[in-house]
Interface confidence: low
């Protein structure tokens, strides 16, 4: 299916930037791994690069305003042509859920005093209003809470005294435009201004004078100049050649505003100067190597001995790494495909170990699942032996690091009838549903 | 394009009444200052009545009392009714509307064809 083509994917906000244009396969646009496409107009955009996870996005709002409730936040696997860790299609969404608590306490509505004392009406002729309060606090509201209702009325009230009010010219408004900006045109061209007779308005009961004279002026425009002929376009110009060597490129087309030139004021002409058209090289763009992660640590050995385990004896491990993803004569992968380093082995050895403090709650797991809960745990942790920490293994070459490597057997006194982890589980609470964000905003 | 159509002129008795309407082919009636406007065989185009977009009306001194102008923004017209109608007031009678320009620099006014009316003595 045709896709819109862009020439640029934003990291920080998944977007897709500087339209290249629409019609063209998804093939066609990834020829070139730095740019990015979208299925319709608003859509998801993917990159054509290799697929791998985007940011984590902020967490939402906590799902309750008090006490404690839930949230969620999301990534995407975006790119194309393959897979992100953990055998995962583009466009998959992962949630995390984690507890959450906005303010501690819930409001507490309050209750109304009694009303107090009528105030004295608001006028002292014709018809006002009078006022009477009560005050928020029988009892007061708790933790931002307030007491329904107003802590003021009013209600009509009538002096039984009449008063006369005369009218008075409020002040001439501006002169409207001219009915006509230039000379030349079908009709005379006028201006008018207005007034009000609303300063005040003459009173009904007893009637008030009515203001005296016209509410409208009217005069003649002067010195106006000629109408403005509005300018117009000429042909357009030749194509320019494509400007780019492979993948897909704009050309462009130019014409001149020139076809009559704009006069006395008139309009420039209304559309484009340019415009362009999709360019197709048919060459693919050549794509550079990227480092695959590195590889686990080989065992800890030293030549010439069957075992160092749980022994002062320094020995050497190493790692590797793979270029993927070279094509079209792209850069190769820059650095080392091998890591060495020197180590003590500790694997399997028995070791005394000291209890953990307890970690953090760890996230809600499932989160989209039924029943999430979190949990957190006390571990069993080896004290390490106090080997030195660093070695001369050959003359000349100065001292090296030493790491611990291997996966040792700790030994702690049991703890509530564990002897190497103690977990603690709770449910969470007002668990928000997961949506697509991308189909929210359709 | 906007056009103003109008209608209801004609020969009338001096004393009697006449009722114009002017119909708008487009919906400028809610933001236009709607005008009547008349003009005798060799006079200047003069100023009858007057409505403005919030309601107000306004009146030559010469017509005061005898002519009201009216609107009805559903049907986008404007109506003039004349009674007590007196010889000197035979003119072509023009319905007008008009509104700022979009750059509030100029005015945009639509203008009706005009329509005779004659009171005989």
């Known amino acids: 299916d045709p896709v819109l083509c862009f020439t640029q994917y934003e990291e920080s906000s998944g977007k897709c930037k500087g339209l290249l244009g629409g019609g063209v396969s998804v093939e066609d646009c990834c020829l070139n791994t730095a740019f990015a496409y979208q299925k319709r107009s608003g859509g998801l955009c993917q990159p054509c690069r290799s697929p791998r996870w985007s940011l984590w996005s902020t967490w939402a709002p906590c799902s309750v305003t008090c006490s404690e409730g839930s949230q969620l936040r999301y990534r995407r696997c975006v790119g194309w042509n393959g897979q992100c860790s953990g055998k995962v299609a583009p466009g998959t969404l992962e949630w995390q859920l984690q507890a959450c608590e906005d303010q501690q306490c819930c409001p507490e509505m309050g209750g109304w005093s009694g009303w107090g004392p009528w105030e004295p009406c608001s006028v002292t002729c014709s018809k006002g209003t009078r006022t009477r309060r009560r005050a928020c606090n029988h009892p007061a509201p708790k933790c931002g809470g307030h007491c329904p209702g107003q802590a003021q009325e009013s209600e009509a009230c009538d002096t039984q005294q009449v008063c006369p009010t005369h009218g008075a010219w409020a002040t001439w408004g501006p002169w409207t435009p001219c009915s006509a900006s230039c000379h030349g045109g079908p009709h005379e061209p006028k201006e008018t201004r207005s007034r009000k007779c609303s300063a005040p308005e003459p009173s009904q009961k007893p009637p008030g004078k009515p203001c005296p004279g016209l509410a409208y002026e009217q005069r003649r425009c002067t010195g106006l100049p000629p109408c403005p002929v509005a300018g117009g376009w000429g042909p357009w110009g030749p194509v320019s050649p494509c400007p780019v060597t492979c993948g897909l490129g704009q050309t462009m087309e130019q014409r001149t505003c020139n076809h009559p030139v704009p006069q006395h004021g008139g309009p420039f002409c209304a559309g484009d100067a340019t415009r362009t058209h999709i360019c197709n090289t048919a060459v693919p763009c050549p794509v550079d190597g990227e480092w695959d992660s590195w590889g686990e640590w080989s065992p800890c050995i030293r030549r010439n001995m069957k075992s160092i385990s749980c022994q002062e004896i320094p020995g050497q491990q190493s790692r590797g790494r793979t270029c993927r993803g070279r094509k079209f004569d792209g850069h190769r992968c820059a650095g080392q495909q091998q890591d060495i380093r020197h180590c003590y082995s500790i694997q399997h050895c028995p070791l005394k170990g000291s209890w953990s403090e307890w970690s953090t709650w760890g996230l809600c797991m499932p989160p989209c699942g039924p029943n999430p809960t979190r949990a957190r745990q006390r571990l069993c942790t080896p004290l390490l032996p106090k080997y030195p920490p660093t070695v001369s293994m050959v003359e000349g070459q100065g001292e090296k690091n030493v790491t611990f490597w291997g996966r040792p057997l700790p030994r702690c006194e049991e703890l509530q009838g564990q002897k190497l982890v103690v977990e603690e589980k709770r449910p969470c609470l007002h668990v928000p549903a997961c949506k697509d964000p991308e189909e929210e905003e359709l | 394009q906007v056009h103003m159509v109008e209608s209801g002129g004609g020969l009338v008795q001096a004393g009697g009444s006449l009722r114009f309407s002017c119909a708008a082919s487009?919906?400028?009636?809610?933001?236009?200052?709607l005008d009547w406007y008349r003009q005798a065989p060799g006079e200047q185009r003069e100023l009858v009545a007057t409505l403005t977009p919030d309601g107000i009306t306004d009146y030559a001194g010469s017509v005061k009392g005898r002519f009201t102008i009216s609107r009805d923004n559903a049907k986008n017209t404007v109506y003039l009714q004349m009674n007590s109608l007196k010889p000197e007031d035979t003119a072509v009678y023009y319905c007008?509307?008009?509104?700022?320009?979009?750059?509030?620099?100029?005015?945009?006014?639509?203008w009706g064809q005009g329509t005779q009316v004659t009171v005989s003595g």
């Open positions: 007008n509307a008009w509104r700022y320009s979009d750059d509030y620099r100029g005015r945009v006014d639509y």
């Open positions: 487009g919906n400028i009636f809610t933001i236009s200052t």
